[in-house]
Interface confidence: medium
């Protein structure tokens, strides 16, 4: 099982994201909408605009997901799209609230095994590769709502029913209460609230802040784990360098995470993943001889 895989990688025990963003409000710059005789003005935001073919992408992803996951076959994807659209269309893209997404949350309600949740921060690709192999574990993007929105950008315009394909608010330069940030904050909070028993989190050991309080994991998920349900948060620190044998579980930011978690009456443990490629290989083929001996 997983313990053998960890053992095979000289894992050391230490008992004991999505982008979340600073709450900074900006207004965006006003630019003329055309060179006609009656110039109109529209908001020019600092971030990229809505992903091309956004409606079609959301609808197609919904159909694909519900086909693959029998437990979600009851979901009406047109209603899901209507609810998604309703959360941000005609609304000021700096004034979006969690309540705006409630109809979508309701339609996307999904039960995942609460003891099989994998959180991640700044290392999405490896987390997804892992759950693709370890099929009984789930990241947020393995749920319907996370799958729908993964890697997409969207926003509307106040008082018009148009999607803004040109620009959307950047969380730092414009505002934090934008459609994308509020969506991820909402679904991340719900995902963390649902977790139980041992919750795993994959962290990027190559970053200067292995645990970042300003990430979605650090600012939303950590604070919404329920101490009455969650016994342990287990961090997996993923090493980047081939010859990197440092114990990153001793990193000051990991100690900070341990402190936050302990204060919430949840136990904390940490493991180094020295060889992520080897780690994935051993998850795929646990019987491999190199996965039962220490490397």
């Amino acid at each position: 099982g997983l313990n053998d895989i960890f053992e095979a990688q000289k894992i050391e025990w230490h008992e004991g994201s999505h982008h979340h963003h600073h709450h900074h409000h900006g207004s965006g710059s006003l630019v003329p909408r055309g060179s006609g005789s009656v110039p109109r003005w529209r908001q020019q935001w600092s971030g990229p605009g809505t992903t091309k073919r956004f409606p079609e992408t959301v609808l197609a992803r919904c159909v694909k997901y519900t086909e693959i996951h029998p437990e979600m076959r009851h979901v009406d994807c047109q209603s899901v799209w209507d609810a998604f659209k309703g959360a941000f269309i005609s609304k000021h893209p700096c004034n979006i609230t969690e309540e705006d997404y409630q109809p979508l949350m309701k339609l996307g309600t999904q039960t995942v095994p609460c003891n099989k949740i994998l959180l991640w921060s700044r290392i999405k690709d490896l987390a997804h590769q892992f759950t693709q192999v370890q099929r009984d574990m789930f990241t947020l993007e393995d749920t319907l709502l996370g799958y729908l929105a993964d890697d997409l950008t969207w926003c509307g315009e106040f008082n018009t029913s148009k999607i803004n394909y040109q620009s959307c608010p950047d969380w730092r330069k414009d505002c934090s209460n934008n459609p994308v940030s509020v969506f991820w904050k909402t679904v991340s909070r719900r995902f963390a609230e649902a977790a139980c028993d041992v919750v795993h989190v994959m962290l990027n050991g190559s970053r200067s802040k292995i645990f970042d309080k300003n990430s979605t994991f650090g600012s939303v998920e950590v604070h919404n784990l329920q101490p009455e349900k969650v016994q342990t948060l287990e961090a997996w620190v993923i090493h980047g360098g081939r010859e990197d044998s440092r114990d990153l579980c001793q990193d000051p930011t990991i100690k900070e995470l341990e402190s936050i978690i302990s204060k919430r009456n949840i136990q904390f443990s940490c493991k180094n993943i020295y060889r992520p490629d080897k780690f994935l290989q051993c998850v795929k083929n646990p019987e491999d001889s190199s996965c039962t001996s220490e490397i």
Epitope: R33, G34, G36, R40, K162, Y165
Partner: antibody
Amino acid sequence: QVQLKESGPGLVQPSETLSLTCTVSGFSLTSYGVNWVRQPPGKGLEWMGRIWNDGSIDYNSALKSRLSISRDTSKGQVFLKMNSLQTEDTAIYFCARGPYNNYWYFDFWGPGTMVTVLS
Amino acid sequence: QFTLTQPKSVSGSLRSTITIPCERSSGDIGDNYVSWYQQHLGRPPINVIYADDQRPSEVSDRFSGSIDSSSNSASLTITNLQMDDEADYFCQSYDSNIDIIFGGGTKLTVL
């Protein structure tokens, strides 16, 4: 100044493949999208598809199975291939620049090239 | 996908004002911007209005565009009609996936 010009064969046999080239100047294909639009004699305009400035491609769903759009950014050329031609594909074929600015219209057009599918 | 419906022909006398409507079949006319093109015989189309009511700088201020929610239509209005305005006019919009939709075109005759 901005210019687009279509080129290709004037006559095509039924069931053959049409290959057209749109050569642009005065702007970069990495900054603007290029669309293909056709107009049968005496009829209206039909959008066929586009290649975005980032290289991604969209097709009119009614023509999707027969169409292929590509480009060579270094030469400033956009290519249209359409297979299984029939007489109803006889039309003037235009390429048009589509600015990526949220309004989705065409600010510059080529003069068009007439393609006749022989009956 | 919606359609855009225009009258086949419209006529007006010299120096008069005409309006060409363009009706959207489903969804709100305000959901997506409308543009207008003028096409003289044997020539490529020229954009005369974009973003519902915006006019390119080189286009005469006799051309104006508007949208009307009550009729779910866009309109192109040409004032002080000139002989050179005799042409085909096409409205154009796009769906939410930015697929382009043209109206069938209106032949304007100047009497």
